[in-house]
Amino acid sequence: SERCDDWGLDTMRQIQVFEDEPARIKCPLFEHFLKFNYSTAHSAGLTLIWYWTRQDRDLEEPINFRLPENRISKEKDVLWFRPTLLNDTGNYTCMLRNTTYCSKVAFPLEVVQKDSCFNSPMKLPVHKLYIEYGIQRITCPNVDGYFPSSVKPTITWYMGCYKIQNFNNVIPEGMNLSFLIALISNNGNYTCVVTYPENGRTFHLTRTLTVKVVGSPKNAVPPVIHSPNDHVVYEKEPGEELLIPCTVYFSFLMDSRNEVWWTIDGKKPDDITIDVTINESISHSRTEDETRTQILSIKKVTSEDLKRSYVCHARSAKGEVAKAAKVKQKVPAPRYTVE
Amino acid sequence: DGCKDIFMKNEILSASQPFAFNCTFPPITSGEVSVTWYKNSSKIPVSKIIQSRIHQDETWILFLPMEWGDSGVYQCVIKGRDSCHRIHVNLTVFEKHWCDTSIGGLPNLSDEYKQILHLGKDDSLTCHLHFPKSCVLGPIKWYKDCNEIKGERFTVLETRLLVSNVSAEDRGNYACQAILTHSGKQYEVLNGITVSITERAGYGGSVPKIIYPKNHSIEVQLGTTLIVDCNVTDTKDNTNLRCWRVNNTLVDDYYDESKRIREGVETHVSFREHNLYTVNITFLEVKMEDYGLPFMCHAGVSTAYIILQLPAPDFR
């Protein structure tokens, strides 16, 4: 057959779905690879074809759309499972073509099992809530498009294994779960089970996400340099090892990049000829405030090195700070000679 | 004394008006702690008598008013059950005659004194007044270039000056003034604010535009690490893929075994009419086989390449 633009296996989209639940999977061509949408393609006379390769097989085979109760069907650019089975796991390909044009992409689909407490190998999205920040909500994710707005589903929320009922500060409100005042004790996995009717059958959608309570923006401060400070002087003799820790506290800030770096005489260590090594360690508090330590080390310091300016810099979305270390050459003790 | 120094704050302030600083450091002051203020490493705490010109009010240090001689380093000591932390506040007091000099002449103004209005929008300026509960603030008046602001485009609402349909003429030097009452005495607070105007970002065209690279070569030494950004502007609602390819294959797939050349994580900055995307390519170590090969940045239907070249020999 004529050449087809093959985008290969799109491993960026590791699609995981639960066994025995409906799943709707959009053809990634229109999401990530092509400039036009399905309607444009369809009206231009292009056809969307689906096929798959079973797990541990090399053979591409067409998808059977003639299963009882239309278990697998296609609607526009969506492949529907009503519901999934464990052996639906495999690589799925959608191909868009006419006589002169062809483009296709494959993606892996994994059908996973869950236990009665919703534990599974599913990768869980993480939703961060600010500590003691007032009312915050999480919304049951990825349920759009499963049922029309005229259908009113029932939604049950769980924390871990327990149904959320009469919890102190967590209130189910339909598709939303409200945290009146988020506390560390609210950390954990939350599951919404959406139950809806369709053509005389009842389907369940299970969605689990991890809630992580993090530092509040109300409490966020610019980076704080604990060390170096004005109270510690790094006094060394030439030939000794110079070790200066730069320890910086960063408040948790959503999507902020925390950076720490040293300059020596105003230059980055990479841009100067002296033999400097820098080791970094990072630790986090329970609310994801971060402490970064960068230890600047010069194995055999020279008297020239002891005259340089060593400045630790830190930056976050809250601002930039800098602090110079006090470095000086140790004055040798006077030597007395007996005449 | 076993106290841990945690940070130094620099404040530049105007003489002859009230000033207050609250000693808070969230990881520490959220618990049960006692706070004591000292001046210039003195062992004697700042007075807590409310009639004193400088006194501690709960966790605040309050100057009623600030005087030129008050410059210096103040320490606030936060003691917990089994912890002690110290914050240093370096206060620099200057004589500021609001209508004589431009606020632009002040050193290192904080963001509170430099604010932005967005052209064409209904926007606002904030008068930052940080004082303890014992201080009662009266209504705020706003000035621009020393004249009280009047006109239907401006409304004073609480600590804000609301500005309708911001124009380029709105840039300039503003001041907000409030009367502060403490223990029956009145003081004037006047904050200067330098206001700049941000322009609307214009963007035309619906095909992604690769700003960089521009189909050119880069001289790079053998064995070095190289990172090249691909910068793309595209419409907000685009569904275009942005990626680096070599020999018509995604670099991550092409170098799947060695992982020597990798595509970075895409980031973007959102503008009014468009997004600016950046996706980089990292050569952990440039090898001979990389020279002369076009590394293509793709963005939807747009492409641009870089070609690595050995630097010309230096015959000096």
Partner: antibody, heavy 118, light 107 residues
Framework: EVQLVESGGGLVQPGRSLRLSCAAS????????IHWVRQAPGKGLEWVSV????????GYADSVKGRFTVSRDNAKNSLYLQMNSLRTEDTALYYC???????????WGQGTLVTVSS | EIVLTQSPATLSLSPGERATLSCRAS??????LAWYQQKPGQAPRLLIY???NRATDIPARFSGSGSGTDFTLTISSLEPEDFAVYYC?????????FGGGTKVEIK
């Protein structure tokens, strides 16, 4: 032509929640503050909430403070009002309105009716 | 909050007559006052803003005056489509407040 279209109203029991939406078109949505104003059946107008162009300034009437949350999505030209712990006295026609000179209202939607009743 | 009191509650007039509506504020609102017209089953419509400025497409028979605490909306010669409820609103302070309304009805 400037248009504001509210949706999401309906009958709800006291103590429950409702989320109203307002879809805007015909003007540069992210240049303006947008407000919610309500009108109880047969009664006058009551201002409910305001949100500035960049969500930096938000204001509420005392009667809804702590229960209602206003938000906006400039990318979608949409305004929202999340109403929790609803009371019978919240029964009203809810309008969204474009701010003019910040706090006057030069364009209004047709309103969405919220009925709180057991 | 600033309370706006409108008077009279109802005004019965014939087409062609002059209508004078009053709005009094419990404290000064400078000139930050607007007037709206509302017909049954419709959303309000901005008539006057900042006490005296006519909004876009508002006929010249509508005029506003006043500042501080006392404001007036005048309709110089009533047209049949002017019979409606009129509200004043202040933007001097949050919460924004409306008057209770004046109903202009056909005599």
């Amino acid at each position: 032509e400037v248009q504001l279209v509210e949706s999401g109203g309906g009958l709800v029991q006291p103590g429950r929640s409702l989320r109203l939406s307002c879809a805007a078109s015909g003007f540069t949505f992210d240049d303006y503050a947008i407000h919610w104003v309500r009108q109880a059946p047969g009664k006058g107008l009551e201002w409910v909430s305001v949100i500035s162009w960049n969500s930096d300034i938000i204001g509420y009437a005392d009667s809804v403070k702590g229960r209602f949350t206003v938000s906006r999505d400039n990318a979608k030209n949409s305004l929202y009002l999340q109403m929790n712990s609803l009371r019978t006295e919240d029964t009203a026609l809810y309008y969204c309105a474009k701010g003019y000179n910040w706090n006057f209202f030069d364009y209004w939607g047709q309103g969405t009716l919220v009925t709180v009743s057991s | 909050e600033i309370v706006l009191t409108q008077s009279p509650a109802t005004l019965s007039l014939s087409p062609g007559e002059r209508a004078t509506l009053s709005c009094r504020a419990s404290q000064s609102v400078s000139s930050y006052l607007a007037w709206y017209q509302q017909k049954p089953g419709q959303a309000p419509r901005l008539l006057i803003y900042n006490a005296a400025n006519r909004a876009t497409d508002i006929p010249a028979r509508f005029s506003g005056s006043g500042s501080g605490t006392d404001f007036t909306l005048t309709i110089s010669s009533l047209e049949p489509e002017d019979f409606a409820v009129y509200y004043c609103q202040q933007r001097s302070n949050w919460p924004l407040t409306f008057g209770g309304g004046t109903k202009v009805e056909i005599k």
